[in-house]
Interface confidence: low
Amino acid sequence: ARSEDRYRNPKGSACSRIWQSPRFIARKRGFTVKMHCYMNSASGNVSWLWKQEMDENPQQLKLEKGRMEESQNESLATLTIQGIRFEDNGIYFCQQKCNNTSEVYQGCGTELRVMGFSTLAQLKQRNTLKD
């Protein structure tokens, strides 16, 4: 099966597919990071969820004014986090709720690892991990 089949709603909804990238980001503290969600339709607003640990359920991300910003156009939603901190570590998910069906679709997640000043090289290899 093609990889995009995983995102396709069998009912054929107008916003049944959503792709999130990158899957992993490792950056030093203080840097700015961006993560993106690509949609096949603008039929529905995108929100962002976050979880800090693998066995937690994602929860609504509270955007810190002046440091975290979300934007959305026809087919692209972007979350920008400036001056990343250790407490920003976690997995971020975009989520789209369709206007016409109220169905909800979620990206596969972007893991953010905020590094100190010595271990960034150790994790660079993770950028090449497959889904």
């Epitope: 929860q59 509270k62 440091r67």
Partner: antibody, heavy 121, light 108 residues
């Protein structure tokens, strides 16, 4: 009906130990983080300790770190708080509380009625 | 760890609007939660994630969080709302949870 029933409180001498238990029922215990909160007589609420759904991650207030140990038995739907080296400052009603979700850092939506711990000689 | 600061007491007449504030450095990036505790009883969650109301909580209870200040508003306070109210959040390290000192609401 969601219920949390604490037990194990009582009178203990300074330096002594107690083990509190909290029996959970009416919800799927294994998918919620859990917390202990205490309230000294006539005082406000004080967060004591929290534990993740799996029990792997535990969190403690500075005032109890190294003396208290939180744990859970998911097979028995029970939360525990082992309290050692108790002092008069630990005298309080101890509440067991269920997290809003699986999130370690969530607030609690359901509380037990509490069990009284008195530390006195 | 961070602290949450509340006024010790607030008094209103029945039918008036009561506002209880909670200030903390971490509140711009952390959710605020509010508990009501009546004398001799366990706390009850009345507001979660800044402004959401659990089922069973009257509509007169509302919450907001702007900057470093969270506010619990009781529109048309009633005698049965007389209680201690506590705000709650995580501190900036996210490893500790913090309660405010509590505010005694008197409706007279």
């Amino acid at each position: 009906e969601v219920q949390l029933l604490e037990s194990g409180g009582g009178l203990v001498q300074p330096g002594g130990s107690l083990r509190l238990s909290c029996a959970a029922s009416g919800f799927t215990f294994t998918i919620y983080a859990m917390t202990w909160v205490r309230q000294a007589p006539g005082k406000g609420l004080e967060w004591v300790s929290g534990i993740s759904v799996s029990g792997i991650r535990t969190y403690y207030a500075d005032s109890v770190k190294g003396r208290f140990t939180i744990s859970r038995d998911n097979s028995k739907n029970t939360l525990f708080l082992q309290m050692n080296s108790l002092s008069a400052e630990d005298t309080a009603v101890y509440y067991c509380a269920k997290g809003l979700s699986s999130g370690d850092r969530d607030a609690s939506d359901i509380w037990g009625q509490g069990t009284m711990v008195t530390v006195s000689s | 760890s961070s602290e949450l600061t509340q006024p010790p007491s607030v008094s209103v007449s029945p039918g008036q609007t009561a506002r209880i504030t909670c200030s903390g450095d971490a509140l711009p990036r952390k959710y605020a939660y509010w508990y009501q505790q009546k004398s001799g009883q366990a706390p009850v969650l009345v507001i979660y994630e800044d402004s959401k109301r659990p089922s069973g909580i009257p509509e007169r209870f509302s919450g907001s969080n702007s900057g470093t200040m969270a506010t619990l508003t009781i529109s048309g306070a009633q005698v049965e709302d007389e209680a201690a109210y506590y705000c709650y959040s995580t501190d900036s390290s996210a490893n500790h949870r913090v309660f405010g000192g509590g505010t005694k609401l008197t409706v007279l």
